[in-house]
């Protein structure tokens, strides 16, 4: 999937299986990514687990879990708030669009999470105070989480190089781990560009991600995924000058 | 291995709530040098871990991108502390502790928010 980190780095990661997205003293978010096509290096998020940890007089521990074709508007125990404590309403789930869009407000840690199902796959967005991001006591075991550190260098796909080369032939092969996977017909480059331009008129990294995804999969739903990801940034990002990211940021500390 | 503490201190120093060091300021290079020193001080106990190697490569990249010299001043991280997670000894009838922004305003002006997103393939 494409990742925008807390430090506004933008990466395309081929991480497969379960990976920690956020892991601090208050919250744990884990994603499971699966290959979008057999043999492809490109992966997308098929499962998301969020654990809100027990916090003072506010909330009991609550677990939220979403999977492909299952975007519940409740925690796994069936509740929609933080439990029986005095400040239980400081954690709330709201269904925005049934089966497609859920918002979780965790006011006790100043955090808003948006989970969507777009096509077969899930998207995730969060707004979180810096000091909550940094509230990690045990650096060893709460370690390498993707939102803070980005994905490891050996798990990154240089999709901008892909974008540059994609006008030529073999676009899908560039995104594959091995020889080109058998897949439904993907779009010609011009069609992908046109479809992405419709939804994402600014040629930023979200637009480029959209083009990459269409060329890689042929699945038009990924256009919407990029579009909603940008919409979520508009809602959640505190710095309105940083809504759009462009190529020049690609070499920021993706490995640090 | 304390390498992630180094990462966090660097992150805090370069995106703190007061005057964050922008990519092109001397403060950014100072923060990078602090980061480099911090990682070197963890080298022996982190040397086999991915986090350490990621940090070292990242620092090298950023040093060259921003033309930072290896020698020069270093910076101190800015950190504030949240109340501890888990059950509190003090039972409070007031839900103010359960509203981050309200309790934050008591200590400082406004929290500095960050964003992370994951989508597509």
């Amino acid at each position: 999937p494409h990742l925008r980190t807390f430090t506004d780095r933008f990466q395309t990661c081929k991480v497969q299986g379960a990976w920690p997205l956020i892991d601090n003293n208050y919250l744990n978010v884990q994603v499971t990514n699966t290959p979008v096509l057999p043999g492809s290096a490109a992966t997308a998020t098929s499962k998301l687990t969020i654990i809100f940890k027990n916090f003072q007089e506010c909330v009991d521990q609550k677990v939220y879990q979403a999977e492909m074709d299952e975007l519940p508007a409740a925690f796994v125990d069936g509740s929609k708030n933080g439990g029986d404590k005095h400040g239980a309403n400081s954690l709330k789930i709201t269904e925005k669009v049934s089966g497609q869009h859920v918002e979780i407000q965790a006011k006790y840690i100043g955090t808003t999470i948006v989970v969507r199902q777009v096509g077969r796959y899930l998207t995730f967005a969060v707004r979180m105070p810096e000091e909550v991001v940094n509230a990690v006591e045990d650096w060893d075991s709460q370690g390498l989480y993707l939102c803070l550190r980005g994905c490891p260098l050996n798990q990154q796909i240089d999709f901008q190089a892909f974008h540059t080369n994609a006008e030529g032939t073999g676009a899908r092969r560039l995104a594959a781990a091995s020889p080109a996977p058998t897949a439904p017909e993907t779009f010609p480059y011009e069609t992908a560009v046109a479809k992405c331009k419709e939804k994402l008129p600014v040629e930023d990294l979200y637009y480029q991600a959209c083009v990459f995804d269409l060329l890689t999969t042929g699945d038009v739903n990924f256009t919407l995924a990029a579009y909603y990801a940008l919409e979520d940034v508009k809602m959640l990002h505190s710095n309105k000058d940083k809504l759009h990211l462009y190529e020049r940021t690609r070499d920021l500390p993706g490995r640090a | 291995c304390k390498i992630l503490k180094c990462n966090s201190e660097f992150w805090s120093a370069t995106s703190g709530s007061h005057a964050p060091a922008s990519d092109d300021t001397p403060e950014f290079c100072a923060a990078l040098r602090s980061y480099a020193l911090c990682t070197r001080r963890t080298a022996r106990t982190c040397r086999g871990d991915l986090a350490y190697h990621s940090a070292v490569h990242g620092i090298e990249d950023l040093m060259s991108q921003h033309n930072c010299s290896k020698d020069g001043p270093t910076s101190q991280p800015r950190l504030r502390t949240l109340p501890p997670a888990g059950d509190s000894q003090e039972r409070s009838d007031s839900p103010e502790i359960c509203h981050y922004e309200k309790s934050f305003h008591k200590h400082s002006a406004t929290p500095n928010y960050t964003h992370c997103g994951l989508f597509g393939d």
Epitope: D140, P152 | L37, R41, R44, T45, R47, G48, L50, Y52
Partner: antibody, heavy 115, light 112 residues
Framework: EVQLVESGGGLVQPGGSLRLSCAAS????????MNWVRQAPGKGLEWIGM????????HYADSVKGRFTISRDNSKNTLYLQMNSLRAEDTAVYYC????????WGQGTMVTVSS | DVVLTQSPLSLPVTLGQPASISCRSS???????????LEWFQQRPGQSPRLLIY???SRFSGVPDRFSGSGSGTDFTLKISRVEAEDVGVYYC?????????FGQGTKLEIK
Amino acid sequence: EVQLVESGGGLVQPGGSLRLSCAASGFTFSNYGMNWVRQAPGKGLEWIGMIYYDSSEKHYADSVKGRFTISRDNSKNTLYLQMNSLRAEDTAVYYCAKGSTPDYWGQGTMVTVSS
Amino acid sequence: DVVLTQSPLSLPVTLGQPASISCRSSQSLEDSDGGTFLEWFQQRPGQSPRLLIYDVSSRFSGVPDRFSGSGSGTDFTLKISRVEAEDVGVYYCFQATHDPLSFGQGTKLEIK
């Protein structure tokens, strides 16, 4: 919860070989250096060696250099210790431990070298 | 190779009383960048070793605050402010500054 489970120990004759395995769970195995440490019966701990997260470097104690080889398979979350030219003094409980310096340890597997 | 020498080798302590274990290194454990990589491990009878202290004085996750580490250069100390029954076992210092890494010979703590 971090879990490390060693296996493959047993009785072997001097000069023989044995391969120990360490199955890891509860953490992202491929992110961490790993160590092997041993403890002879009634004795103290002896560091054997370590391997980097990506197998790019390995370091060994002088007592096992050239005889023991540490390897790993990150796709299987498993660490290995191949022991050749075994001697009586290699008799010990062998532990694997997570991290570039050991933090979490397995329960150990006993290796007895005897004729 | 670095040799770590612990003393005493046996330490009988009364419950609730403090205990102190020394670890001396044959060469300085401070590296050129100012890092000092000395750890302390506890091994209870019949159990695997457990990390208590790393980087001289940092307590590992879940370790009670009655354990503390201090020292620099070649001299290091592990202190237990009030010994409890569960503290019985062998304590090892361990250095990671120089290859090959090495352990002290161990100090056996027992209850008087």
